[in-house]
């Protein structure tokens, strides 16, 4: 209802003698700010006076008068929303009702709060989950309906009176909704904690005991078992008897079923706490345990390893590895079922005892071909000697031995001959299946291990073969020593180093890359004409007429080889210049006259210069000079000059005669 003041605070607060109480409180007045506040203890309304009677614990008025009790009781609020109170220390007789009398300018209100102060510190309360199972983490909660800023406390957990190692998380609440101190402990109980006492102890700041709460743990767990065996070492010989007993040391709830397991598999019709094994055989060796179940699940005992002893059985040999590669290491393992394990071994190679070999394993670090054969063994323990088994075969493999390449041809071999080679070897395991030849070529292999080289090349210097099984063994290369005519014959200019100019001294060299046999002869020719028989062809002073196509020949006892034709180019300045005239050297005025500068030059003329009879240059640079229309005054001697990269040449004078036209003569 809108005519009420609105308050929020805990309904009841709890404390004990000598402690303190902190009352969190908020309010909202009907109008304006708070003008007067009185804290009553057990207030009662007096109808006569229309006022409240009771012990005044705190008073705050406009004139600011405060009773002496105010040192113990404090109003920590304000004039419009906070009404928090503190009583420190709190006494037993403070129990009852606290009345907060609030007055604003026009409105009044009495708010009641219950205070419960006990003589001694009251105990906390332990809260447990409904069910606790072994090894499943649970949270234990210890709750105390008390918290006060002026009175620090602590909650400690104990198991059977001993502080618990696990870290607890303590939290406090001092709000208008609730006031408490809480400790939470995360804990994974084991079956051994069943029935143990857990205590939550309230202590003051100095660790002094104030109160406590205790609970007994009910930890649900699978049955816990112990197994006993006769004989106690569980070692017997075939035909002996064995007894095993299963004892339950703890179970919560009670167990329901019993069974026995061997090597993890359930034994049929064995559902009592005792297992009797009569006249045991070696097959009954193994790991035994008992299993007892309750509502939580099955519990298993530790395993008992029953060993039934017997003499070695017939042995077998395992080879690591066969077939073995020559030079590798091999290990032989003698395998024989026996209990106890064999203490001595005898080894045989091809039926013959191997001296000094008494271990389970025989190691040969470097296998040789003679190590091949049958290996067998005999095992021995305290109960007797086993039989020799069938044995195992060691196959020693190795690459082909003593491989050679053999030339079948008569010597010497000439370029173009057909050459036959064979690949021979001494021994091989496994058998030779293929052959390889170096270098590779498009050669024929008419039969296994034979190579036929048709049209043998001049550069087939050496050949090597390999005989191959799983590996290839290469023979040393054999030299074919092929004889051939001179190769790569070519003309090379030795001098000059740059281009050849007319008048230069010129030397040409006839080069070849190789010849076998080495003794050679040279021949030079130009246009089918023999010029010389030396390796060099020399010109003291070259002329343009020496230009042309040159070849050299080199021959030996096998044959002769010619070079490619080599063009000798002679560079020279323009020469044999002359001026030709078209249509002729006599032209009628008004017509066209074309003067052409003809020349012989290498490289060709790049540009021309034209001159008249007074050696004055005309503004033309091309081979032809065209005069159109030609005039009588143009009559005279003309000459030209040609230029190329080598130099210049000039023509003799050529005279142009321009005569008058009939029209001109007629006008005169």
């Amino acid at each position: 209802d809108s005519s009420k003041w609105v308050f929020e605070h805990p309904e009841t607060l709890y404390a004990w003698e000598g402690a303190c109480v902190w009352i969190p409180c908020t309010y909202r007045a009907l109008d304006g700010d708070l003008e007067s506040f009185i804290l009553f203890h057990n207030p009662e309304y007096n109808k006569n006076t229309s006022k409240f009677d009771g012990t005044r614990l705190y008073e705050s008025t406009k004139d600011g008068k405060v009773p002496s009790e105010q040192k113990r009781v404090q109003f920590l609020g304000d004039k419009n929303k906070n009404c928090t109170l503190s009583i420190h220390p709190v006494h037993l007789n403070d129990s009852g009702q606290l009345g907060l009398r609030m007055e604003s300018k026009t409105e009044k209100w009495m708010e009641r709060i219950h205070l419960n102060v006990s003589e001694r510190p009251f105990p906390p309360h332990i809260q447990l989950p409904p069910e606790i199972q072994e090894s499943q983490e649970v949270t234990l909660t210890c709750l105390l309906n008390f918290s006060c800023y002026g009175y620090p406390i602590q909650l400690q957990w104990l198991l059977e009176g001993v502080p618990m190692r696990q870290a607890a998380v303590t939290s406090t609440s001092l709000t208008i909704k609730s006031v408490f101190t809480r400790s939470e402990l995360k804990f994974s109980p084991q079956w051994s904690h069943h029935g143990k006492i857990v205590t939550c102890q309230l202590q003051d700041a100095d660790g002094k005991f104030l109160s406590n709460d205790t609970v007994q743990l009910n930890v649900k767990h699978t049955p816990k078992l112990e197994i006993k065996v006769t004989p106690s070492d569980a070692i017997v010989r075939e035909g002996d008897s064995v007894t095993m007993t299963c004892e339950v040391s703890s179970s919560n709830p009670e167990y329901t079923t019993v069974s026995w397991l061997k090597d993890g598999t359930s034994l049929k019709k064995q559902n009592t706490f005792t297992l009797n094994l009569r006249e045991v055989t070696k097959d009954q060796s193994g790991k035994y345990c008992c299993q007892v179940s309750n509502d939580v699940g099955p519990g298993r005992s530790e395993e008992v390893f029953l060993q039934v002893q017997y003499a070695p059985e017939p042995s077998t040999v395992q080879i690591l590895h066969s077939p073995a590669v020559e030079g590798s290491q091999v290990e032989f393992l003698c395998m024989s079922l026996a209990n106890p394990l064999p203490t001595n071994y005898t080894w045989y190679h091809n039926g013959k005892e191997m001296q000094g070999r008494t271990e389970e394993k025989v190691h040969i670090p470097k296998i040789l071909p003679w190590h091949a054969g049958t290996y067998s063994c005999v095992a021995e323990n305290i109960l007797g000697t086993g039989q020799r088994g069938p044995g195992a075969e060691l196959d020693v493999q190795y690459p082909p031995k003593k491989v050679t390449t053999v030339i079948q041809n008569p010597m010497p071999i000439r370029e173009g001959d057909t050459v036959t080679l064979s690949c021979n070897y001494n021994s091989s395991n496994p058998s030779v299946t293929r052959y390889e030849w170096k270098p590779h070529g498009a050669w024929e292999e008419p039969s296994l291990g034979v190579l036929k080289i048709q049209n043998v090349g001049w550069d087939n210097t050496t050949i090597a073969c390999a005989a191959c099984n799983s590996w290839c063994s290469w023979a040393s290369p054999v030299a074919l020593n092929v004889q051939y005519a001179p190769r790569d014959v070519r003309v090379r200019k030795i001098k000059p180093l740059s281009e050849i100019h007319s008048g230069n001294s010129v030397s040409l060299q006839c080069d070849f890359s190789s010849s076998h046999p080495k003794e050679v002869q040279f021949f030079w020719e130009k246009n089918g004409r023999l010029l010389g028989k030396e390796s060099q062809l020399n010109f003291d002073s070259i002329s343009p007429e020496d230009a042309g196509s040159y070849s050299c020949w080199v021959n030996n006892s096998i044959g002769q080889t010619a070079s490619k034709a080599w063009t000798l180019e002679v560079l020279y300045a323009p020469r044999r210049l002359r001026v030709s005239m078209s249509p002729g050297d006599q032209v009628m005025e008004g017509k066209s006259a074309t003067l052409t500068c003809e020349s012989d030059a290498n490289p060709p003329v790049s540009h021309y210069t034209w001159f008249d009879w007074n050696n004055q240059s005309l503004p033309y640079h091309s081979q032809k000079l065209r005069l159109e229309p030609v005039k009588v005054q143009h009559s005279g001697a003309y000459w030209c000059q040609g230029t190329n990269s080598v130099g210049k040449g000039r023509s003799p004078l050529s005279t142009l005669t321009v005569y008058y036209s009939p029209e001109t003569i007629g006008r005169r």
């Epitope: 790049s606 540009h607 008249d612 009879w613 007074n614 004055q616 240059s617 005309l618 503004p619 033309y620 640079h621 091309s622 032809k624 065209r626 005069l627 229309p629 005039k631 005054q633 143009h634 005279g636």
Partner: antibody, heavy 122, light 107 residues
Framework: QVQLQQSGPGLVKPSQTLSLTCAIS??????????WNWIRQSPSRGLEWLGR?????????DYAVSVKSRITINPDTSKNQFSLQLNSVTPEDTAVYYC????????????WGQGTMVTVSG | DIQMTQSPSSLSASVGDRVTITCRAS??????LNWYQQKPGKAPKLLIY???SLQSGVPSRFSGSGSGTDFTLTISSLQPEDFATYYC?????????FGGGTKLEIK
Amino acid sequence: QVQLQQSGPGLVKPSQTLSLTCAISGDSVSSNSAAWNWIRQSPSRGLEWLGRTYYRSTWYNDYAVSVKSRITINPDTSKNQFSLQLNSVTPEDTAVYYCAREVSGTSAFDIWGQGTMVTVSG
Amino acid sequence: DIQMTQSPSSLSASVGDRVTITCRASQSISSYLNWYQQKPGKAPKLLIYAASSLQSGVPSRFSGSGSGTDFTLTISSLQPEDFATYYCQQSYSTPLTFGGGTKLEIK
């Protein structure tokens, strides 16, 4: 320094004769190391060489084939100038006409006149 | 007649750029090749003669090269005043002929 000053009408009627003169200062029209050229420029034809006159031991002329039948370039030694006459003009002859000196040393047009815009229009 | 082919016909560049213009003759003209610069409303101005010789008074950033049929004009670092049209011309034989021009514009 050498300068070339052009003169002549800017408008010529079709079929009439276009006449331009190029006055030389700083050099001689009779120089035996120069040639005196006429060049024209139009948007359609670009730069087009028309012809030249030059003196060595006598006077010579060279003309472009495209105008050979209609062109005359004459030197005037008394006035140290040379002229261009182009007969039977058509609107195709509308262009900027330049005179230029070509020297033997460079074989290039090193000095140019200021140019004359000639319009052929009826 | 000897035809002169210039490329490109137009070119956009910025101040400081290096620019190259090429000119090809329809037949060998030795080194008788000249380069001109023309600005709007003005007569052409000789820059390079005989393919590679710099005309007196022309800045050294202009250079020419080539002989036979292929020729090049290079401006090493463009200046604002270099934006114009450039022409090549052969003086090997009559009729004397010019290239179609290359217009160099500011980018």
